[in-house]
Amino acid sequence: EINGSANYEMFIFHNGGVQILCKYPDIVQQFKMQLLKGGQILCDLTKTKGSGNTVSIKSLKFCHSQLSNNSVSFFLYNLDHSHANYYFCNLSIFDPPPFKVTLTGGYLHIYESQLCCQLK
């Protein structure tokens, strides 16, 4: 077991791709969520609030992503065996304090049935 193992189903497979679910507390207002493959940053999403409670969503490393009030989903497509690895949701919480950086992760197993283009 890895330190910070996700206590929920982190990987959801569909159509030869995978949705990687990164949960965060619903009380969190401003944060940055990074998806790490091993130690490499694959994707990130930052949510901040400006004056008048205007919400800003930014990505420096863009992936197809989906934001809800307690999770960020990152989507990876065209799965192959090279995608098998440890993936981590690296969450930086800016608001409310205390500021903290937390890790949640799991191993993505790739099975033949989940590949996008199986050879018949």
Epitope: S5, Y24, P96, P97, P98, T102
Partner: antibody
Amino acid sequence: QLQLQESGPGLLKPSGTLSLTCAVSGGSISSSSWWSWVRQPPGKGLEWIGEIYHTGSTNYSPSLKSRVTISVDKSKNQFSLKLSSVTAADTAVYYCARGHYDILTGSFDPWGQGTLVTVSS
Amino acid sequence: DIVMTQSPLSLPVTPGEPASISCRSSQSLLHSNGYNYLDWYLQKPGQSPQLLIYLGSNRASGVPDRFSGSGSGTDFTLKISRVEAEDVGVYYCMQTLQTPLTFGGGTKVEIK
């Protein structure tokens, strides 16, 4: 009323692994709270060890990070602490506590009653 | 890490008299939302710590109104308007602005 109760061995040998559990009663561990461990060596002050959210997200004190693992078991409504390679310096009363976010801050309320762990050969 | 420094180390008090404890942080605990991220705890002899004050000046539920917290930025004070015998113990300040969460070294309040 939320209550926390620590349990685990009170005596350990050097180089062993400390394992403690904190049982949560009167409320759900899946609430919007971070669950922390804090320790207090005999006659000394308080030191924050780390915390976990019910999803499994963890955050540790840098000084202990290489030796600490905190995990959560939602089915048993409890969370646990493991501290590896212990020495006499890890002798302390270990407390579990809830980060009380419903008052806008990480304030600890309530605390467990604490359990004394002694490391000695 | 934010370093928290408390003074005095020990405080002999007379019941009915006021008492004051100081806490200083190595960096400002004032967040852009206007709150100071500082708590005060009391650890009575043989007991677990209990929350007295959160966000610098807010009394926790059930805490008598003789306890008050004040200050902003890096300098904070816990005041007891009239000390009672049950107030003896060690008082700790703690910053909750960022992790690692850090505590002051404690102030031991005892009856003269």
